[in-house]
């Protein structure tokens, strides 16, 4: 909350309300929707961001082929239940008592059921594949320059430790960013790859979550990198459990 001190705003999360009634009269910022205090020196968890949002209203040789167990977020927005740390609860239910299990990035990983559905644990998403297509440019970007720029972006803008950016693949016009973070690798204070990916996704869509900062201006050697399509695949430590009906659909 010290990051919020100067003019009582939250640099890392515009979906907050800040007031000078924190400990010692310091600035304190609370997420819309949940009322939970957030640490403005780092990224806010995706679950709290989604809750706040709901309350505010080509096969290439070098590209990764998502595994058969990779999940895509097809369900879109919902008002999630977050745990005391602001993480997704393993079981999510809607207002009509339809329930489902989610992974640590809040993406559904089971068929929908009723209130009797059990989700024994929150399964960690340990591998995220961000698949981007950039707008046509005069020529291809230099791969190593692109790699360096994207790693810099995740390190500086999203505060993600460089070791969690596993690889950057490029075959014009497709860019793939691989984020990997096992439970054992994530230390206290480390930004979660799911949170970093969500901030990046919102930045790419021109919906930056950062307070007062300009939108994302991605440049490689001065050349603007403009993304026209984004697909994100999520791989969990335990494969998802969907019925055959869905798998064959």
């Amino acid at each position: 909350h010290t990051a919020a001190q100067d003019n009582c705003t939250c640099p890392t999360n515009k979906m907050t309300v800040c007031s000078p009634d924190g400990p010692g009269g310091r600035c304190q910022c609370r997420a819309l929707g949940s009322g939970m205090a957030v640490d403005c020196s780092t990224l806010t968890s995706k679950c709290l961001l989604l809750k706040a949002r709901m309350s505010a209203p080509k096969n290439a040789r070098t590209l990764v082929r998502p595994s058969e167990h990779a999940l895509v977020d097809n369900d879109g927005l919902y008002d999630p239940d977050c745990d005391p740390e602001g993480r997704f609860k393993a079981r999510q239910c809607n207002q009509t008592s339809v329930c489902w299990c989610v992974n640590s990035v809040g993406v559904r990983r089971t068929d929908k059921g009723d209130l009797s559905l059990r989700c024994d644990e929150l399964v960690r998403t340990h591998h995220i594949l961000i698949d981007l297509r950039h707008r046509p440019t005069a020529g291809a970007f230099n791969h190593s320059d692109l790699d360096a720029e994207l790693r810099r972006l995740f390190r500086e803008r999203y505060r993600l430790h460089p070791k969690f950016v596993a690889a950057v693949h490029y075959e014009q016009p497709t860019i793939q960013i691989e984020l990997r973070q096992n439970t054992s690798q994530k230390a206290a204070g480390d930004v979660d790859i799911g949170d970093a990916a969500y901030y990046f996704e919102r930045d790419i869509k021109g919906e930056s979550l950062f307070q007062g900062r300009g939108g994302l201006d991605l440049r490689v050697r001065g050349e603007p990198l403009q993304v026209e399509r984004t697909l994100i695949y999520y791989l969990d430590e335990i494969p998802p459990k969907f019925s055959m009906k869905r798998l064959t659909a």
């Epitope: 309300v17 924190g22 205090a37 005391p84």
Partner: antibody, heavy 116, light 111 residues
Amino acid sequence: QVQLVQSGAEVKKPGASVKVSCKASGYTFTNYWIGWVRQAPGQGLEWIGDIYPGGGYTNYNEKFKGRATLTADTSASTAYMELSSLRSEDTAVYYCARGTGGGDYWGQGTLVTVSS
Amino acid sequence: DIVMTQSPDSLAVSLGERATINCRASQSVSTSSYSYMHWYQQKPGQPPKLLIKYASNLESGVPDRFSGSGSGTDFTLTISSLQAEDVAVYYCQHSWEIPYTFGQGTKLEIK
């Protein structure tokens, strides 16, 4: 000095609505949350919800959602709590307080009596 | 919702003696930096008065015989030397997440 002054006592019939006001002075009204708490006779404190006058943001206790409406008039530095579809169990003293949790200044309270 | 449970419900302590009131939250209300727990005193016919904010921060103007401690789920309000004017009902409240619930109250009397 900081002061929160609430409107006077009200007697209402079941099914009616009541609107309690809370006029703030001595601080920048738009910078702090205003919380609303009620206390039934001889009972403990119950949190209703809060409002941030600077943006009109509100939070509600699920128990009161749909029945309680919190609003604020920044030009008058006044917060309002309206409770509809009143029933006898809504008879209580209603307080406004400055702050989210750990309200440091409180209004004197407004007794709302619901009786047929 | 987070349930706040105070103990005891009522307490009788001799003047000058120590009074201790406990509050337990149904889940942790602390981060590594702060505990989102507050203590109030309420006398008959008056609004609650904030004594302690964020588990241990004494509010301005509150006598230093009042102190607060604890973290996680277990918190304590201590009055080191009870005075006659301390007779009141004491409430704990969390501000961890919506709704910001209160404990049921502890009535403190003179023995």
